[in-house]
């Protein structure tokens, strides 16, 4: 990924398009990698995270990580691709506008991961059941 | 259809303050980033300023660093711009407009607001 | 910052005449380049997003082109409603630059 400030010309090798044959381009996203956070028992929180880049690859999604253990909490933004696994998970909720977090089966830690594909979506990490998408007439406002 | 209305322009003294609001509607608020760009009486246009969907990362112009302040309130669809410490050199029109998704229109400004007229004069 | 440079700052045309404005970036944008048309008294438009493509709407006579630091909007046969202010912008990078504008105008 490409971030603003770094003179660099995006990568546009690989075109994307969509079903109806748009050009799809890279999205932004946050992307600070791995930081201590102090996120903890909200329903929401935001990254401070102060880097926005361009996603190097058109398909790419924005991705948050939220990690608990015994001595710390990390937050990871990042973009990637949602047809790769991250941290061994599939991203099912890539086509989503919100990052709601989604908690996730690792040994030793509490572990939650969401992305989404709207611009700089991982910026604000949603933890709330409010936002739970098993809900359809949720997932018409999430969607709309 | 998306609709975007400034409100709040009028004539202030050097050195006072004004609000300007813009009430959108006709598209998902929260998740589009929100600028204002700015146009002296018969000159080009300036951006002024962003803040994104979520309203955690705000920029600012040089010109207007430390005296502006872009927000927004996501239940109400309005975006805001605090205006302080207003100079001659800052009346302009000054316009609300949308940043369409990168994915999408790689982030061109697709929708403008109609405009308010800030004047700054004693 | 990067600086837009737009070329030429006015010009004169009629109506059908084929007119070609050109936008020069500092330094590489990719193909991050958008036009905009502006009427005395309104807000400004979108036309091209992207460097080359037509936004919604937007009459196929208008046209756009280039990668990488040099672009191009034409109008390939000008209609009396083009007649207007025309301003590029870059959306590479924050803050999103404009050209200085290039106003079209009937000879």
């Known amino acids: 990924t490409i971030p603003p400030h770094v003179q660099k010309s995006v990568n546009n090798d690989m075109i994307v398009t969509d079903n109806n044959g748009a050009v799809k381009f890279p999205q932004l996203c946050k992307f600070c990698d791995v930081r201590f956070s102090t996120c903890d028992n909200q329903k929401s929180c935001m990254s401070n995270c102060s880097i926005t880049s361009i996603c190097e690859k058109p398909q790419e999604v924005c991705v948050a990580v939220w990690r608990k253990n015994d001595e710390n909490i990390t937050l990871e933004t990042v973009c990637h691709d949602p047809k790769l696994p991250y941290h061994d998970f599939i991203l099912e909720d890539a086509a989503s506008p919100k990052c709601i977090m989604k908690e996730k089966k690792k040994p030793g830690e509490t572990f939650f991961m969401c992305s989404c594909s709207s611009d700089e979506c991982n910026d604000n990490i949603i933890f709330s059941e409010e936002y739970n998408t098993s809900n359809p007439d949720l997932l018409l406002v999430i969607f709309q | 259809e998306v609709q975007l209305v400034e409100s709040g322009g009028g004539l202030v003294q050097p050195g006072g303050s004004l609000r300007l609001s813009c009430a959108a509607s006709?598209?998902?608020?929260?998740?589009?980033?929100m600028t204002w760009v700015r146009q002296a009486p018969g000159k080009g246009l300036e951006w002024v300023s962003v803040?994104?969907?979520?309203?955690?990362?705000?920029y600012y112009a040089d010109s207007v660093k430390g005296r502006f302040t872009i927000s927004r309130d996501n239940s109400k669809n309005t975006l805001y711009l605090q205006m302080n410490s207003l100079r001659a050199e800052d009346t302009a029109v000054y316009y609300c407009?949308?940043?369409?998704?990168?994915?999408?229109?790689?982030?061109?400004?697709?929708?403008w607001g109609q405009g308010t007229l800030v004047t700054v004069s004693s | 910052d990067i600086q837009m440079t737009q070329s030429p700052s006015s010009l004169s045309a009629s109506v059908g005449d084929r007119v070609t404005i050109t936008c020069r970036a500092s330094?590489?944008?990719?193909?991050?380049l958008n036009w905009y048309q502006q009427k005395p008294g309104k807000a400004p438009k979108l036309l091209i997003y992207?460097?080359?493509s037509l936004q919604s709407g937007v009459p196929s006579r208008f046209s756009g082109s280039g990668s990488g630091t040099d672009f191009t909007l034409t109008i390939s046969s000008l209609q009396p409603e083009d007649f207007a202010t025309y301003y590029c912008?870059?959306?590479?990078?924050?803050?999103?630059?404009f050209g200085q504008g290039t106003k079209v105008e009937i000879k």
């Open positions: 006709g598209f998902t608020f929260d998740i589009n980033a």
């Open positions: 992207a460097a080359s």
């Open positions: 407009a949308r940043r369409g998704q990168y994915r999408e229109i790689a982030g061109a400004t697709d929708y």
């Open positions: 330094q590489s944008i990719s193909s991050y």
């Open positions: 912008q870059q959306s590479y990078s924050t803050p999103p630059t």
């Open positions: 803040i994104s969907g979520s309203g955690g990362t705000t």
